[in-house]
């Protein structure tokens, strides 16, 4: 993460959206990479 | 000083898409999320969604989603808001915004008239 | 959506004397960090909005100290102790707490 950018209120107000929106990306690119190693 | 500049006012078809440009300086680009907020005569101002520079991420209010795409060229430091499928409830002023530490909305560009009209 | 209501629509002030706008939201807009990210914006005819007040009370830079927001809850008030012609335009309050960010509808501040 960008350290200055917690400096905008925006920041704070969206963190769990973010931190939310972050795992989700990790979950989809997990099952993309396990898609990926069962086709091999 | 922190400056937010927009592109000039457009008019355009039913069904057609806009695509508004917000050039910042005066500041890190990266450092602030950019938001958009729009003004149709009267109405209240309504939040469209919200992205962050650094990252990419997108928030955008549900009432606009998959109507409206945020993007933005940290190169370029400027921001875009395309809204698709205009329809003439979709004339209005099309604002972005920056915030601070304290505040969500503390400056706000010079705004960008989009009118739809057959 | 939290909905935000601003009365009076419309207010006639005479120059120099104090004027007064409620807001209201429809359900508590205190945040789970415990603040209240309510906000009050001015646009002039012909202008960008303008921020005045954030976090219900504290004033913006720049903005002068006849400005001035309070209120809990659900239950906001923003004061102009003398009102001035720069003052003439529309206000809005605004909530950050609850996503999607909702405005208020508008207050027209107007000559008597």
């Known amino acids: 993460d960008n350290p200055s950018l917690s400096i905008d209120l925006t920041f704070h107000l969206l963190r769990t959206l973010l931190e939310l929106a972050r795992t989700q990306s990790q979950r989809e690119r997990a099952e993309q990479n396990r898609i990926i190693f069962d086709s091999v | 000083q922190v400056q937010l500049v927009q592109s000039g006012a457009e008019v355009k078809k039913p069904g057609a898409s806009v695509k508004v440009s917000c050039k910042a300086s005066g500041y890190t680009f990266t450092d602030y999320f950019m938001k958009w907020v729009r003004q149709a005569p009267g109405q209240r101002l309504e939040w469209m969604g919200v992205i962050n520079p650094n990252q990419g991420d997108i928030f955008y209010n549900q009432k606009f989603k998959g109507r409206v795409t945020i993007t933005r060229d940290t190169s370029a430091s400027t921001a875009y808001m395309e809204l698709s499928s205009l329809r003439s409830e979709d004339t209005a002023v099309y604002y972005c915004?920056?915030?601070?530490?304290?505040?969500?909305?503390?400056?706000w560009g010079q705004g960008t008239l989009v009118t739809v009209s057959s | 959506d939290v909905v935000m209501t601003q009365s009076p629509l419309s207010l006639p002030v005479t120059l120099g004397q104090p004027a007064s706008i409620s807001c209201r939201s429809g359900q508590s807009i205190v945040h789970s960090d415990a603040n209240t990210y309510l906000e009050w914006y001015q646009q002039r005819p012909g202008q960008s909005p303008r921020l005045l007040i954030y976090?219900?009370?504290n004033r913006f830079s720049g903005v002068p100290d006849r400005f001035s927001g309070s209120g809990s809850g659900t239950d906001f008030t923003l004061k102009i102790s003398r009102v001035e012609a720069e003052d003439l335009g529309v206000y809005y309050c605004f909530q950050g707490s609850h996503i999607p960010w909702t405005f208020g509808g508008g207050t027209k501040v107007e000559i008597k």
């Open positions: 915004a920056r915030g601070t530490d304290r505040a969500l909305f503390a400056y």
């Open positions: 976090k219900v009370s």
